[in-house]
Interface confidence: low
């Protein structure tokens, strides 16, 4: 039913569509969803609203990073009386609505996950037509993307005093542990320097002084797997060559 009330602060007449028991907006999202890179993930989002019989136009929106201001990654619109939410935006074509906004469900499927998708996502619904109302989740759902290690760069670089150093950068989630093996490092894996956290999911380990020619191997490992890559150091006339 429709309830009319006087707003005494502004002395305006407000008409609000009211329906017990849900007299105010809420959104329900889990704190976190985990999935592996390359797989798909579902971000659940359901809501309650005070307009139980609302059948007008609506827009469903998902944004990334921060609520209210983050970039939209998905948007769809449903016409009055329609249960079909027509997609207007799907970033890189990887986002698809699973839920039915008419049934208070904005759940979203994200395809072909990458580590860059590891962020917080916020669902939002907007009503237009007879009722003008909107609501957005304030805490959002964290999409936690896991990935086996991948070595993204391995190189030999000149150091002062005609020396050489090796750098190995890997990505993965959980961040992989890096270890070097090679001539004069012993047969066992030896992390010469503690890996340092880089940007996002990148980890870099440095071998500060390569004293012998030969093959140096960087191994990256986490709970999901391991990866290795090698460089070869051979010096002639003060130059170095590296192959991976």
């Amino acid at each position: 039913f429709v309830r009319t009330k006087i707003d005494t602060t502004e002395n305006l007449l407000n008409t609000e569509v009211h329906s017990s028991p849900a007299q105010r907006w809420s959104m329900q999202v889990p704190p976190e969803v985990s999935a592996e890179a390359g797989d798909a993930a579902v971000l659940p989002c359901t809501f309650t609203h005070p307009h139980r019989h609302y059948d007008g136009p609506l827009t469903a929106i998902w944004r990334a990073g921060e609520p209210y201001a983050g970039p939209q990654v998905f948007r769809c619109a449903a016409a009055r009386g329609s249960e079909l939410c027509q997609t207007a935006l799907s970033l890189h074509g990887r986002f698809r609505l699973l839920g039915n906004p008419r049934r208070n469900d904005l759940s979203l499927r994200v395809e072909r996950l990458a580590l860059a998708d590891d962020r917080r996502y916020f669902c939002r619904v907007e009503f237009a037509g007879d009722v003008h109302d909107r609501y957005e989740s304030r805490h959002g759902v964290r999409l936690h993307v896991t990935a086996a290690p991948r070595i993204v760069n391995i190189s030999v670089l000149p150091s002062p005093a005609h020396a050489f150093r090796a750098l190995c950068t890997a990505e993965g989630e959980p961040p992989p542990a890096l270890a070097w093996s090679g001539p004069a490092l012993g047969n066992s894996l030896a992390a010469v320097r503690s890996p340092r956290e880089g940007h996002g999911h990148l980890v870099t380990a440095e071998l500060p002084a390569l004293t012998h020619d030969g093959r140096y191997t960087c191994t990256a490992a986490n709970s999901l797997g391991r990866s290795e890559a090698s460089v070869y150091l051979f010096r002639f006339h003060g130059a170095s060559g590296a192959s991976t």
Partner: antibody, heavy 114, light 113 residues
Framework: QVQLKQSGAELVRPGASVKLSCRAS????????INWVKQRPGQGLEWIAR????????YYNEKFKDKVTLTAEKSSSTAYMQLSSLTSEDSAVYFC???????WGTGTTVTVSS | DIVMTQSPSSLTVTAGEKVTMSCKSN????????????LTWYQQKPGQPPKLLIY???TRESGVPDRFTGSGSGTDFTLTISSVQAEDLAIYYC?????????FGAGTKLELK
């Protein structure tokens, strides 16, 4: 008229389990959360958990996670709460309440005694 | 968990008197998104379930007499009964409606002199 009708009082032995029911009427059962709240004699209120019957999504208070299991039966518009491994600490009145606690059931008294 | 602290634990009043009771939370219940305080007040009479009085700290539930007023923001909230009636004798609970687990205060018992 929105109503929540709860099952009758239960007298149970320590270590046993009991399943309480909360039958909803007057609204679309699958649209709104149902909460469960505990009140020990002469004490305050404790939120136990909630269930969204539309998807069976549940949220539990960590304190009750190993004690309670919530389910919902759409066909009968009934929410259930099972309490397991009962002790005297579980003797209480248990209320079901609609999301936002606008509407409450009358409560079910559970007495654990040998 | 958010802890809700109510005071006093009991109040003895005479009919027609103005009454205030306090509820404090150890974390802010103000949601920056919609600028609402997610604090709810309930009234519970003996042998009955609680009854919703006020939500969003100050919005009176439909059918609740206007002698009941909620106020406050952030972590400090107050329930005021402008002129206590005999039917108001009950226990009043405040509740964190902002984050899970939802938590209640221990209650303020209103008794008649």
């Amino acid at each position: 008229q929105v109503q929540l009708k709860q099952s009758g009082a239960e007298l149970v032995r320590p270590g046993a389990s009991v399943k309480l029911s909360c039958r909803a009427s007057g609204y679309t059962f699958t649209d709104f959360y149902i909460n469960w709240v505990k009140q020990r004699p002469g004490q305050g209120l404790e939120w136990i958990a909630r269930i969204y019957p539309g998807s069976d999504e549940t949220y539990y208070n960590e304190k009750f996670k190993d004690k309670v299991t919530l389910t919902a039966e759409k066909s009968s518009s009934t929410a259930y709460m099972q309490l397991s491994s009962l002790t005297s600490e579980d003797s209480a009145v248990y209320f079901c309440a609609l999301w936002f606690f606008d509407v409450w059931g009358t409560g079910t008294t559970v007495t654990v005694s040998s | 968990d958010i802890v809700m602290t109510q005071s006093p634990s009991s109040l003895t009043v005479t009919a027609g008197e103005k009454v205030t009771m306090s509820c404090k939370s150890n974390q802010s219940l103000l949601n920056s998104g919609d600028q609402k305080n997610y604090l709810t007040w309930y009234q519970q009479k003996p042998g009955q379930p609680p009854k919703l009085l006020i939500y969003w700290a100050s919005t009176r539930e439909s059918g609740v007499p206007d002698r009941f007023t909620g106020s406050g923001s952030g972590t400090d909230f107050t329930l005021t009964i402008s002129s206590v009636q005999a039917e108001d004798l009950a226990i009043y609970y405040c509740q964190n409606d902002y984050s899970y687990p939802l938590t209640f205060g221990a209650g303020t018992k209103l008794e008649l002199k």
